[in-house]
C-alpha cells in the first residue's frame, strides 16, 4: 500500500478502536418482573453503560454484526431449600433473532445452590457466572433468564449484571 | 494538528493498539496479608505479566483511560463450617479513585461454600469468578478483596488470580 | 473521504475483522473419552466456530502469537456423593508447548459440588467457569481437563464449552 492507503487504514483503525461495541448493564429493583420474561437492567446509572449497542426490554440489541464476548453474573440467595425437586436454578443467555420464532440458548448453567445451607445457618448465597463468544448479526438480541428468578438477590448493581463487547 | 501531526498521532495510536493494555496477576504466598487490606499479587513470575498497566500494593493501576474487562478468580477451601452466618464469603473487585475517599464496589459475589462439606468428607473446595466491563480513568486503581481471606487457598498462581484488558 | 479513502478503509476493516483470532468450541456427545485425555469439542456445528485458531484432538492451537483471554465452562451434575474425598472436582485449562514435555497448568478450579444435594433431593447441579489472559506462542495448544470427567453433564453445547480470543 502507498502512503494514502496506510493513512486511510490508520484512520479506520482509529475509528474502529473508538467505537468497539461494549456494554455493561446492572441489576436494579425493577429487574425482576415475575412475568416470566427476561430480567430487566439498568443501562445508564452508576456503572451501567451502552457503547455501540442498544437496549430494549431486557435485551442487548446488536447494531454491528460480529463476534461478541457476552457475559452475565447473577447473585443468588435464599433461606433453606425449596421443598421437593424445584431446588435447581437455571441461569442462561439467550438469543432472539428475526429468523426464528423462539429464543436460542447460547450459554446456560444449572446450579443447586440451596444445598449450601449449613446446620448452623439456613441462609445461603451463591453466584453464577456465564461468559463466552458468540456471533451476532445486526438486529439480533441477547437476554438473560433465571429460573427461579425469585432467588436472584439484587442490591446495588454490583452483584447481578449483564454485558458484552466485540472481540 | 497538520497532516504530519495527525500522521504521528495515528502511528502512535497504532502502536499503542498493538500494546493494548492487559495484565494477569497471580496468587502467591504473600497474597494474604491478614491486615484487612486487599490481596497482593505476583506481577512478573510464571504466568503473571503487566502490559500497559502498572501495579502498586495489590492494585492494578490504569495508565490509559478506557473501558476494561476486569476479572478475578479466587480458590476457596476449608474443613467444616465456621459456626453462625460468618460462613458467607464476599469476593469483590473495587475501584480506588482520587475523586472519592472510599473504595467503590465494581463487581461482587457472595457465596456460602462450606455447605459443600459432605457426610463423608468435611473438606470442601469452591471457586468464585468475577468478570465485567468498567470504565477506568488514568490513575484509577482496581483491587481484589475477599472476606474472610483466611479461606482463600493459594498454591501455584493458577487457582487465584486477577487481570484486566482494554476492550 | 474520496472513493480511494473509503476503499482503503474497507480493506482495513475487512482485514482487522477477519484476523483477530477467536474461537468458541462446544461440548458434544464425543467430548468425554474416558481415556484420561482432555475433553474433546465440537468446532463447527451450532454455536461452535474457529477464526484464526485451529483445533487438534481437544486442543485449541495458536497460529498467531499474542495474549489471549481463554475460558471454559463445564456443567457438573450427579446424584448423591461418591464416598470419600473423590467428591472434589478439578477443572483446568492447560498449555502444551513444544518446549516442555508436560502440560502446564494455566487456570484451575477445585470444587466440591455434591455437597449441594439436599434433604429432599439427591440430585445436584453445579457449574465451573474459568477465564484469564495468558501469552501463547504460535504452535502452542490449550486443552481442558476435568477430573472426574464422569460428572460433566453434556447436553446441547450451551452448558460446557471452551473458547479464546486475542486481546
Amino acid at each position: 500500500d502507498g502512503p494514502a492507503g496506510s493513512w486511510e487504514q490508520l484512520i479506520q483503525e482509529r475509528r474502529s478502536h473508538e467505537v468497539n461495541p461494549a456494554a455493561h448493564l446492572t441489576g436494579a429493583n425493577s429487574s425482576l418482573t415475575g412475568s416470566g420474561g427476561p430480567l430487566l437492567w439498568e443501562t445508564q446509572l452508576g456503572l451501567a453503560f451502552l457503547r455501540g449497542l442498544s437496549y430494549h426490554d431486557g435485551a442487548l440489541v446488536v447494531t454491528k454484526a460480529g463476534y461478541y464476548y457476552i457475559y452475565s453474573k447473577v447473585q443468588l440467595g435464599g433461606v433453606g431449600c425449596p421443598l421437593g425437586l424445584a431446588s435447581t436454578i437455571t441461569h442462561g443467555l439467550y438469543k432472539r433473532t428475526p429468523r426464528y420464532p423462539e429464543e436460542l440458548e447460547l450459554l446456560v448453567s444449572q446450579q443447586s445452590p440451596c444445598g449450601r445451607a449449613t446446620s448452623s445457618s439456613r441462609v445461603w448465597w451463591d453466584s453464577s457466572f456465564l461468559g463466552g463468544v458468540v456471533h451476532l448479526e445486526a438486529g439480533e438480541e441477547v437476554v438473560v433468564r433465571v429460573l427461579d428468578e425469585r432467588l436472584v438477590r439484587l442490591r446495588d448493581g454490583t452483584r447481578s449484571y449483564f454485558g458484552a463487547f466485540m472481540v | 494538528d497538520g497532516p504530519a501531526g495527525s500522521w504521528e498521532q495515528l502511528i502512535q495510536e497504532r502502536r499503542s493498539h498493538e500494546v493494548n493494555p492487559a495484565a494477569h496477576l497471580t496468587g502467591a504466598n504473600s497474597s494474604l496479608t491478614g491486615s484487612g487490606g486487599p490481596l497482593l499479587w505476583e506481577t512478573q513470575l510464571g504466568l503473571a505479566f503487566l502490559r500497559g498497566l502498572s501495579y502498586h500494593d495489590g492494585a492494578l493501576v490504569v495508565t490509559k483511560a478506557g473501558y476494561y474487562y476486569i476479572y478475578s478468580k479466587v480458590q476457596l477451601g476449608g474443613v467444616g463450617c465456621p459456626l453462625g452466618l460468618a460462613s458467607t464469603i464476599t469476593h469483590g473487585l473495587y475501584k480506588r479513585t482520587p475523586r472519592y475517599p472510599e473504595e467503590l464496589e465494581l463487581l461482587v459475589s457472595q457465596q456460602s461454600p462450606c455447605g459443600r462439606a459432605t457426610s463423608s468428607s468435611r473438606v470442601w473446595w469452591d471457586s468464585s469468578f468475577l468478570g465485567g466491563v468498567v470504565h477506568l480513568e488514568a490513575g484509577e486503581e482496581v483491587v481484589v478483596r475477599v472476606l474472610d481471606e483466611r479461606l482463600v487457598r493459594l498454591r501455584d498462581g493458577t487457582r487465584s488470580y486477577f487481570g484486566a484488558f482494554m476492550v | 473521504d474520496g472513493p480511494a479513502g473509503s476503499w482503503e478503509q474497507l480493506i482495513q476493516e475487512r482485514r482487522s475483522h477477519e484476523v483477530n483470532p477467536a474461537a468458541h468450541l462446544t461440548g458434544a456427545n464425543s467430548s468425554l473419552t474416558g481415556s484420561g485425555g482432555p475433553l474433546l469439542w465440537e468446532t463447527q456445528l451450532g454455536l461452535a466456530f474457529l477464526r484464526g485458531l485451529s483445533y487438534h484432538d481437544g486442543a485449541l492451537v495458536v497460529t498467531k502469537a499474542g495474549y489471549y483471554y481463554i475460558y471454559s465452562k463445564v456443567q457438573l451434575g450427579g446424584v448423591g456423593c461418591p464416598l470419600g474425598l473423590a467428591s472434589t472436582i478439578t477443572h483446568g485449562l492447560y498449555k502444551r508447548t513444544p518446549r516442555y514435555p508436560e502440560e502446564l497448568e494455566l487456570l484451575v478450579s477445585q470444587q466440591s459440588p455434591c455437597g449441594r444435594a439436599t434433604s429432599s433431593s439427591r440430585v445436584w447441579w453445579d457449574s465451573s467457569f474459568l477465564g484469564g489472559v495468558v501469552h501463547l506462542e504460535a504452535g502452542e495448544e490449550v486443552v481442558v481437563r476435568v477430573l472426574d470427567e464422569r460428572l460433566v453433564r453434556l447436553r446441547d453445547g450451551t452448558r460446557s464449552y471452551f473458547g479464546a480470543f486475542m486481546v
Partner: antibody
C-alpha cells in the same frame, strides 16, 4: 390468593389434648414449610418449630419438645398442631405461618387460634 | 440462640412524624431479618424482609436497613393506621427468634 385458615378457638382443661388445623390455599402446599408460632396474652412471638410439608419431617424448638406434635394431611393441604397434656401456661394464641425459602421469612400467617386452658 | 434486642419498648408519636425502631442481634445474622406489624386481635403482617426489601403492597414510608447485627425499621410520615406493635425476626439460624416488640402509640 394465598390464605392460611385456622380452626376456631378452644377451651380445654389441664391434662387434655387439643389439635389445631391450618388449611392452606392459593399455592402448592408441599413447596413451602409451615411454621408454628405461640403468642401468650400480652406477650411477644415465640417460634415453636416447623414441619417440612414435602417430607413430613418436623423440627421442634427446645421449649416445645415432648408434648407438642406437628403433622400433615397433604391431600387436604392442611397442617396440624397437637398439644398433649395441656398446662395453664399453654394458654395462648397459636399461629401457623408459611416458611418462605426465597428469604421473605414468614410471609403469610393464619388468623390465629386461641387456646384457653382452665380448670 | 440468637437474641434480638428491640428498642424502644414503647414509642409515642404524632401523625406525620418520622420514627425509627432498632433491633440488635446477639450474633451475625447476615441480612436475614424481617419486620412485622401486628394490630390487636390480628395476626402479624410482613412488612420487610432481607432487612430492607418491602413486601408486596407495603407503603414506601416503611424502610429498613442494616446487616450483621444492627437493624433499623423507619416509618416516615407516620399515619394513624401505623399505630401497632412491631416485631423484628431473624430467620437465618435455628431456632428462629423474634424481638420482644415495640408498641407505637399516639402522643
Amino acid at each position: 390468593q394465598i390464605q392460611l385458615l385456622q380452626s376456631g378457638p378452644e377451651l380445654e382443661k389441664p391434662g387434655e389434648t387439643v389439635k389445631i388445623s391450618c388449611k392452606a390455599s392459593g399455592y402448592t402446599f408441599t413447596n413451602y414449610g409451615m411454621n408454628w408460632v405461640k403468642q401468650a396474652p400480652g406477650k411477644g412471638l415465640k417460634w415453636m418449630g416447623w414441619i417440612n410439608t414435602y417430607t413430613g419431617e418436623p423440627t421442634y424448638a427446645d421449649d416445645f419438645k415432648g408434648r407438642f406434635a406437628f403433622s400433615l394431611e397433604t391431600s387436604a393441604s392442611t397442617a396440624y398442631l397437637q398439644i398433649n397434656n395441656l398446662k395453664n401456661e399453654d394458654t395462648a394464641t397459636y399461629f401457623c405461618a408459611r416458611d418462605n425459602w426465597d428469604g421473605k421469612g414468614m410471609d403469610y400467617w393464619g388468623q390465629g387460634t386461641s387456646v384457653t386452658v382452665s380448670s | 440462640d440468637i437474641v434480638l434486642t428491640q428498642s424502644p419498648k414503647f414509642m409515642s408519636t404524632s401523625v406525620g412524624d418520622r420514627v425509627s425502631i432498632t433491633c440488635k442481634a446477639s450474633q451475625d445474622v447476615d441480612t436475614a431479618v424481617a419486620w412485622y406489624q401486628q394490630k390487636p386481635g390480628h395476626s402479624p403482617k410482613l412488612l420487610l424482609y432481607w432487612a430492607s426489601t418491602r413486601h408486596t403492597g407495603v407503603p414506601d414510608r416503611f424502610t429498613g436497613s442494616g446487616s450483621g447485627t444492627d437493624f433499623t425499621l423507619t416509618i416516615s410520615n407516620v399515619q394513624s393506621e401505623d399505630l401497632a406493635d412491631y416485631f423484628c425476626h431473624q430467620y437465618g439460624s435455628y431456632p428462629l427468634t423474634f424481638g420482644a416488640g415495640t408498641k407505637l402509640e399516639l402522643k
